[in-house]
């Protein structure tokens, strides 16, 4: 039976949401010894490297100079070592931003809170959009996906410290393709806790609201900043 | 309908203790924050603090922070605040108030008043 | 703290005529900025949410406008159960803060 080699990694600089008109590098990370990558986009051939010397090499990037709504979409790759292919990357989902129109995001009660209060944040855009997406800055992303017809509600429900932090939304015009992001929102979560059965850095979000809670595993692999790339995207699976 | 029955009134004397409790019904207590605002005869408002019943999380004026001490009781719903080391100042109506992104429903107040 | 000052302190206005009251954040708060209404002897009551979104039960008279450090109420016509004072308060940052409030009589 024919083995294949282990995946790759596959992720993009700075980052995978990359506004309009503007640089990405998609890197893909294999083995020493590869004679060739292959990225592929939308299940197709888009690219191929082969480095130079294969045996003190074990990444390949390519480079897309000018953004756009053609180049948005889901990224693998594969790598040979002589004839033998890896496994595929996962999925890498570069999403082009700054289309359109600019959302506004607002939190409620207030951006400063008492720890346990219920808080919930709405990001508005007015151009025809259904969904909406609520991000948190950091090296765990949260990604909260939320629909409406003009606003989407995302409640966080009670929240602890762990929640402190700026957050910003953008509306969706198809998976890959995303509004400005709104101007950021910092949350303050204050308050002395007597008697919690919440732990303070353990956010617990409501199974049916939050899409994934997302922190990576190939954290050794990767970059501090290649980190939300490699997690966060997972939302759009 | 939301109500919040506050208790009644107390005459206190300087550098004694004080504790006014507030009992909630028509909602569920442990899903708002309460707070407590505090009213001198023929002045503003003044916010004092507020807790979170579900875990407990207190958040404190500063000008109060060591004097005041806001406690609540899920299986009453009734939220207390305790005011020690009264001063003739301290003379005023204090209000529980629900934060439901405003403070929309309000107790009907408790006038303490301090006086030697 | 946010300081939040409200002007004028004292507005006398005739019945079914128009009042304005302002209310001035020290910094920007947004439309975190909540109104209340308080008549002699009882607590205050909510009449406008964020700056400018109406409360259920609240005649629709009443209305807010505003956004950053400037904000306003406004009761179109003035019906005689509306002399009263009115607070501001600030929603975006503990501590929470009021406005020293604004007396509306009757002129």
């Known amino acids: 039976q024919q083995q294949t080699l282990p995946k790759p990694f596959i992720w993009a600089e700075p980052h995978f949401m990359v506004p309009k008109e503007k640089q990405v590098t998609i890197c893909c990370q294999g083995n020493y010894g590869a004679v060739e990558y292959q990225l592929h986009f939308e299940g197709s051939l888009f690219a191929v490297d082969r480095p130079k010397p294969p045996e003190r090499i074990n990444k390949v990037q390519f480079y897309i100079p000018d953004m756009n709504s053609r180049m948005a979409g889901q990224y693998s790759c594969i790598y040979r070592v002589g004839e033998l292919w890896s496994e595929p990357s996962n999925l890498l989902d570069l999403v082009v931003t700054e289309m359109y129109d600019t959302p506004t995001l607002s939190v409620h009660p207030g951006p400063e809170v008492i720890s346990g209060e219920k808080v919930t944040f709405y990001c508005r855009l007015d151009t025809a959009t259904s969904m909406f997406l609520l991000l948190k800055e950091g090296r765990s992303s949260h990604v909260q996906r939320g629909y409406g017809k003009v606003q989407a509600e995302f409640p966080l429900g009670p929240v602890t410290t762990a929640h402190r932090g700026t957050y910003r939304c953008f509306g969706s015009y198809n998976n890959h393709a995303w509004s400005f992001p709104s101007e950021p929102v910092k949350l303050l979560v204050t308050g002395d806790i007597e008697n919690t059965s919440l732990a303070p850095e353990d956010p617990t979000f409501p199974a049916d609201t939050w899409g994934t809670y997302l922190l990576t595993t190939e954290t050794g692999l990767q970059k501090d900043h290649a980190l939300w790339d490699h997690t966060a995207q997972n939302l759009l699976r | 309908q939301v109500q919040l029955v506050q208790s009644g009134a107390e005459v206190k004397k300087p550098g004694s203790s004080v504790k006014v409790s507030c009992k909630a019904s028509g909602y569920t207590f442990s899903e708002y924050t309460m707070h407590w605002v505090r009213q001198a005869p023929g002045q503003g408002l003044e916010w004092i603090g507020g807790i979170s019943p579900n875990i407990g999380g207190t958040s404190y004026n500063q000008k109060f922070k060591g004097r005041a001490t806001i406690t609540a009781d899920k299986s009453t719903s009734t939220a207390y605040m305790e005011l020690s080391s009264l001063r003739s100042e301290d003379t005023a109506v204090y209000y529980c108030?629900?934060?439901?992104?405003?403070?929309?429903?309000w107790g009907q107040g408790t006038t303490v008043t301090v006086s030697s | 703290e946010i300081v939040m000052t409200q002007s004028p302190a004292t507005l006398s206005v005739s019945p079914g005529e128009r009042a304005t009251l302002s209310c001035r954040a020290s910094?920007?708060?947004?439309?975190?900025l909540h109104w209340y209404q308080q008549k002699p002897g009882q607590a205050p009551r909510l009449l406008i949410k964020?700056?400018?979104q109406s409360i259920s039960g609240i005649p629709a008279r009443f209305s807010g406008s505003g956004s950053g450090t400037d904000f306003t109420l406004t009761i179109s016509s003035l019906e005689p159960e509306d002399f009263a004072v009115y607070y501001c308060?600030?929603?975006?940052?503990?501590?929470?803060?009021f406005g020293q409030g604004t007396k509306l009589e009757i002129k």
């Open positions: 964020y700056a400018s």
């Open positions: 308060q600030n929603g975006h940052s503990f501590p929470l803060t």
């Open positions: 910094q920007s708060i947004s439309d975190y």
């Open positions: 108030a629900r934060r439901g992104g405003s403070f929309d429903y």
